[in-house]
């Protein structure tokens, strides 16, 4: 025997106060699958967070943050403070980068900047708080006379 | 036990106006969220305006915006619905609805009352 809350469909509950007919759900609720006994509140996107999408009667609300916070968390379930590119968030708020680490971020931690000479290389550009060091050529590609590469011999004329 | 008892429907002609109130016993209509939906004649319910948390923010359906004002008196424990520049469309039963939430999470709604007709023709 089917459930005759099946046919209810989204945007609906089954309501067993009036003979399992579908009722629409109430404003500020929604349902997003069919056959559901009641419908969900929706989400309110207050203080730090704004709304992104509008709840509906088959869809929650979606939140996104004010500017100057980002989101953290599966569906945005927190707002974290932006800092500056060259920043950390400290639990005593934006802090500036330790020397030999950057971050090129308003969010995030402060990270090391690359050892160029674990790869061989050298330090073509200096980091920064902001930025990472770049790396270039290895000293020995670098050093006079150690090219490998030989120029052609000059062509000769016939007769010569 | 929760009653609510819907009065002030009529034959009305198009673009004129009535006023439904909703006199309620077993709760606080100031303390809870109310509102009105509506069955058209071979149509499902459809939610119509709402008073929701004690704070006393308004929902208008789009079909009745600009149209309808939902009110309360707290002091008759009573809920209205002054309907204006109504339309063919209007017409329906009206149903009183008190919004229940449950202890899951859960939202649903209840009509305990029979309703009133609002019936728009020239």
């Known amino acids: 025997l089917q459930d005759p809350c099946s046919n209810c469909p989204a945007g609906t509950f089954c309501d067993n106060n009036r003979n399992q007919i579908c009722s629409p759900c109430p404003p500020n609720s929604f349902s997003s699958a069919g056959g559901q006994r009641t419908c969900d509140i929706c989400r309110q996107c207050k203080g730090v967070f704004r709304t992104r999408k509008e709840c509906s009667s088959t869809s929650n609300a979606e939140c996104d943050c004010t500017p100057g916070f980002h989101c953290l968390g599966a569906g945005c379930s927190m707002c974290e403070q932006d800092c500056k590119q060259g920043q950390e968030l400290t639990k005593k708020g934006c802090k500036d980068c330790c020397f030999g680490t950057f971050n090129d971020q308003k969010r995030g931690i402060c990270r090391p900047w690359t050892n160029c000479s674990l790869d061989g290389k050298s330090v073509l550009v200096n980091g920064t708080k902001e930025r990472d060091v770049v790396c270039g050529p290895s000293p020995a590609d670098l050093s006079p006379g150690a090219s490998s590469v030989t120029p052609p011999a000059p062509a000769r004329e016939p007769g010569h | 036990e929760v009653q609510l008892l819907e009065s002030g429907g009529g034959l009305v002609q198009p673009g004129g106006s009535l006023r439904l109130s909703c006199a309620a016993s077993g709760f606080t209509v100031s303390a809870e969220d109310v509102g009105w939906v509506r069955q058209a004649p071979g149509k499902g319910l459809e939610w119509v305006s709402a008073?929701?948390?004690?704070?006393?923010?308004?929902y208008y359906a789009e079909s009745v915006k600009g149209r309808f004002t939902i009110s309360r008196d707290n002091a008759k424990n009573t809920l209205y619905l002054q309907m204006s520049s109504l339309r063919a469309e209007d017409t329906a039963v009206y149903y009183c609805?008190?919004?229940?939430?449950?202890?899951?999470?859960?939202?649903?709604?209840?009509?305990r009352g029979q309703g009133t007709q609002v019936t728009v023709s020239s």
């Open positions: 609805a008190r919004v229940v939430y449950h202890a899951g999470g859960g939202v649903t709604y209840d009509t």
């Open positions: 008073i929701l948390d004690s704070g006393g923010s308004t």
